[in-house]
Amino acid sequence: EEELQVIQPEKSVSVAAGESATLNCTATSLIPVGPIQWFRGVGPGRELIYSQKEGHFPRVTPVSDPTKRNNMDFSIRISNITPADAGTYYCVKFRKGSPDVELKSGAGTELSVRAKPSAPVVSGPAVRATAEHTVSFTCESHGFSPRDITLKWFKNGNELSDFQTNVDPAGKSVSYSIRSTARVVLTRRDVHSQVICEVAHVTLQGDPLRGTANLSEAIRVPPFLEVTQQSMRADNQVNVTCQVTKFYPQRLQLTWLENGNVSRTEMASALPENKDGTYNWTSWLLVNVSAHRDDVKLTCQVEHDGQPAVNKSFSVKVSAHPKEQGSNTAAENTGTNERDYKDDDDKHHHHHH
């Protein structure tokens, strides 16, 4: 009689998470009598997966009826596979005894589990940054297997190249995680921009997963300030306007100062949005010229999104005859750009990022 062989025909089997895995095993002889057991791993720490003789194995079903006459098929089916089921499975023949004695093992079948990555989660910087600055976005996805995975970044549909990606762990594992950090240079036009993290994996059948983040959460566009005087009214009142333009987010507080004293404070709310996502706001102040003997120094002070205040000052010339006054006298400090503003006294210099 030929010696018993335990044959596991497949060296490896790959199964999608949630599906069933069939692990094949046949014996070449009915002799000797004794049960089959399936183990994951080898050595003293091996895990019993199924025993024909005894035990409760709710997820494991023998492929062939164990009571079938002449049965030499000891294949099993494991249901509802998860990444934790990955490993090498051994079909082991025992000889009947008290207790049964291990006789021969199959060569083993490695079960790998194809698990889909979780939906990518994109997170942006904790604090806002201004145009021309670089911010980092992080994309994370977890629980996938096998390890091979492709991650791409896009900004408004254009692929980005400045990013770094890590897949963990480096060694063998039941499942893996990916983390990628992309560096994005902001522009003033990015309020409506979006970054997309795209993950492609064998389990996704060519339909990648995407995570998105809006740059509106990461950007601050500081306002332009312009203070102008309208024509003197017949009642000796001057209408001075402060135009605050192209700012984002909307959170903004404007304070009028007359000769350094607070005249009025306003909070921006429910402003219409510009096409580029920024906001404009105009505030005006009526100054009664006849109530002043000296020139009146008006300051429009804007505090945007919790940043240090930006001042723009304007002097209303009381000494000049109202009728002769120009309709659009400019503010004293006109040498400003979108980031740097000086008040008249050059007391403060504010640089905004």
Partner: antibody, heavy 119, light 110 residues
């Protein structure tokens, strides 16, 4: 360790029925056939029938086909053999035996239940 | 049905001597490359005990003085050196079809 524990001795009158139980332990009850064999005093072994507890498939010796019924209760891992219309020549020790190799053989035996049929 | 006939019905052998029991089937019990014959030993007041399965394979814990041989229709159980504890009735059983037993052979010490 495989164990088959049988019910106690019975005394029955001719024409009556007897139901012998066999409680299994030490193995997965539904994975192995249970056989029933009897032995009249001073006589040889006589196979009665076998049952697969997983699906209650049965095979009977033609001699007992009309009088014997095998059943199992998988919740208690117990096999039963009922014999009806008893006659005096049914007096015997009734054994249950487990087939460990699915070879239609008897690897592990209960200790037997003596059924005496007497008027 | 297959009928099994054992011979002799009884046998007396001296301690240490060889004992041979035969079992003949009314038709071949070979199938699928196996000979479907089993041998049991039954001592007084005890249930039978499996000795040999598939004609020639000793069950676990069975001393190696017991051996089985044969094929087709003729089979033999041999005890190479009889021990006092071997006194018993020996039965052959076939399972090529549904199980049937031989009538038994009583083995005693001479």
């Amino acid at each position: 360790q495989v164990q088959l524990v049988q019910s106690g001795a019975e005394v029955k009158k001719p024409g009556a029925s007897v139901k012998v139980s066999c409680k299994a332990s030490g193995y997965t009850f539904t994975n192995y056939w249970i056989n029933w064999v009897r032995q009249a005093p001073g006589q040889g072994l006589e196979w009665i029938a076998m049952i697969d507890p997983s699906d209650s498939e049965t095979h009977y010796n033609q001699i007992f086909k009309d009088r014997a019924t095998l059943t199992t209760d998988t919740s208690t891992s117990t096999a039963y053999m009922e014999l009806r219309s008893l006659r005096s020549d049914d007096t015997a020790v009734y054994y249950c035996a487990m087939d460990y190799g699915s070879l239609y053989a008897m690897d592990y035996w209960g200790r037997g239940t003596l059924v005496t049929v007497s008027s | 049905d297959i009928v099994l006939t054992q011979s002799p019905d009884s046998l007396a052998v001296s301690l240490g001597e060889r004992a041979t029991i035969n079992c003949r089937a009314s038709k071949s019990v070979s199938s699928s490359g196996y000979n479907w014959i089993f041998w049991y030993q039954q001592k007084p007041g005890q249930p039978p005990k499996l000795l040999i399965y598939l004609a020639s394979n000793r069950d676990s814990g069975v001393p190696d003085r017991f051996s089985g041989s044969g094929s087709g229709t003729d089979f033999t159980l041999t005890i190479s050196s009889l021990q006092a504890e071997d006194v018993a009735v020996y039965y052959c059983q076939e399972s090529r079809e549904l199980p049937t037993f031989g009538q038994g052979t009583k083995l005693e010490i001479k």
